[in-house]
């Protein structure tokens, strides 16, 4: 499973697309800034095994994909960029799924600490509630776009785990 190269390449492409999606100046949205508490401390203090890293990355990308697949998201972004970004995420999910199967066998599921999955889910819950509270305003989406870019960059420890041999 040659994930590290493909994943970092797709990750870079997704980040570039996400950067291009920005429509308004972040400076005009300073009043909407919010602390979403990406669980980086939990991730940084942990040496991820490959199967663990794959599961947590999958959850992050799945939640990002779901977030940007909503009707509210379609209204907020330039359609062709949004489609390219979603396609990139979808490809990443496919790569990760193929790796899960290859790493642990078709019938098995990877063992890992479920609290990391929950930490990711709760992080995206905070993002979802923020968007709803702000009624999916352009500034709220801008804040979320910047946050997702940060979270994609944060997950370095997870990416180290991808290079590890279990």
């Amino acid at each position: 499973c040659d994930l590290p190269q493909t994943h970092s390449l797709r990750n870079r492409r997704a980040l570039i697309l996400l950067a291009q999606m920005g429509r308004i100046s972040p400076f005009s949205c300073l009043k909407d800034r919010h602390e979403f508490r990406f669980p980086e401390e939990e991730f940084d203090g942990h040496q991820f095994q490959k199967t663990q890293a794959i599961s947590v990355l999958h959850e992050m990308i799945q939640q990002t994909f779901n977030l940007f697949s909503t009707e509210d998201s379609s209204a907020a972004w330039e359609q062709s960029l949004l489609e390219k970004f979603s396609t990139e995420l979808y490809q990443q999910l496919n790569d990760l799924e193929a790796c899960v199967i290859q790493e642990v066998g078709v019938e098995e599921t990877p063992l890992m600490n479920e609290d990391f999955i929950l930490a990711v889910r709760k992080y995206f819950q905070r993002i979802t509630l923020y968007l709803m509270e702000k009624k999916y305003s352009p500034c709220a989406w801008e804040v979320v776009r910047a946050e997702i870019m940060r979270s994609f960059s944060f997950s370095t420890n997870l990416k180290k785990g991808l290079r590890r041999k279990d």
């Epitope: 990760l96 199967i101 599921t109 609290d115 929950l118 819950q125």
Partner: antibody, heavy 119, light 108 residues
Framework: QVQLVQSGAEVKKPGASVKVSCKAS????????MHWVRQAPGQGLEWMGE????????IYAQKFQGRVTMTRDTSTSTVYMELSSLRSEDTAVYYC????????????WGQGTLVTVSS | EIVLTQSPATLSLSPGERATLSCSAG???????LYWYQQKPGQAPRLLIY???NLASGIPARFSGSGSGTDFTLTISSLEPEDFAVYYC?????????FGQGTKLEIK
């Protein structure tokens, strides 16, 4: 619209296994974790575990670990919950419920499947 | 495991009255992950309130939720005949996810 349709009622003997199915439609099956919750007659709700239909990853409640197996078939958008070594206390209605975030968390439930364990 | 204790177990009220249902957590629950469900006989539970105080789609405004930490409340301002059912609080703040034992709201 989102729909979760479960298999029919089952009667099992103690020690046997039961496999309940939950067929999803109206959304992208692989995008959301599916949960199983049970309810004994006249009792409250009890969370059993969840499965990510995308890659089959499961998380089980400690209480059911070793007795429960959740699987999925992406070709038919169906998840399964198998419970083994059945005892009378497992007599309950078993529900599948779709995960999500915000107002989507457990917003969609199957109609329930009654499993009766009796000798 | 976070134990959720609901009180009272049964609440007998008349239509038009105000209902206050309590949910007490054994340890602190972040309000974002505390939900309320309604269940009628022979039916699956129905989402009422998400993240402590937000009304789910299609739920009438007479329902409201509040609380934080370990104490949460579901209030029905003026009971309608269709509100008589069992109500469950639920947390997904930590594994295993848990439900309260339920409060049965019955007609007096």
């Amino acid at each position: 619209q989102v729909q979760l349709v479960q298999s029919g009622a089952e009667v099992k003997k103690p020690g046997a296994s039961v496999k309940v199915s939950c067929k999803a439609s109206g959304y992208t099956f692989t995008n959301y974790w599916m949960h199983w919750v049970r309810q004994a007659p006249g009792q409250g709700l009890e969370w059993m575990g969840e499965i990510n239909p995308s890659h089959g990853r499961t998380i089980y409640a400690q209480k059911f670990q070793g007795r429960v197996t959740m699987t999925r078939d992406t070709s038919t958008s169906t998840v399964y919950m198998e419970l083994s070594s059945l005892r009378s206390e497992d007599t309950a209605v078993y529900y599948c419920a779709r995960g999500g975030l915000g107002p989507a968390w457990f917003a969609y439930w199957g109609q329930g499947t009654l499993v009766t364990v009796s000798s | 495991e976070i134990v959720l204790t609901q009180s009272p177990a049964t609440l007998s009220l008349s239509p038009g009255e105000r209902a206050t249902l309590s949910c007490s957590a054994g340890s602190s629950v972040d309000s974002s992950y505390l939900y309320w469900y309604q269940q009628k006989p022979g039916q699956a539970p129905r989402l009422l309130i998400y993240s402590t105080s937000n009304l789910a789609s299609g739920i009438p405004a007479r329902f409201s939720g509040s609380g934080s930490g370990t104490d949460f409340t579901l209030t029905i301002s003026s009971l309608e005949p269709e509100d008589f059912a069992v109500y469950y609080c639920h947390q997904w703040s930590s594994y295993p996810f848990t439900f309260g034992q339920g409060t049965k709201l019955e007609i007096k």
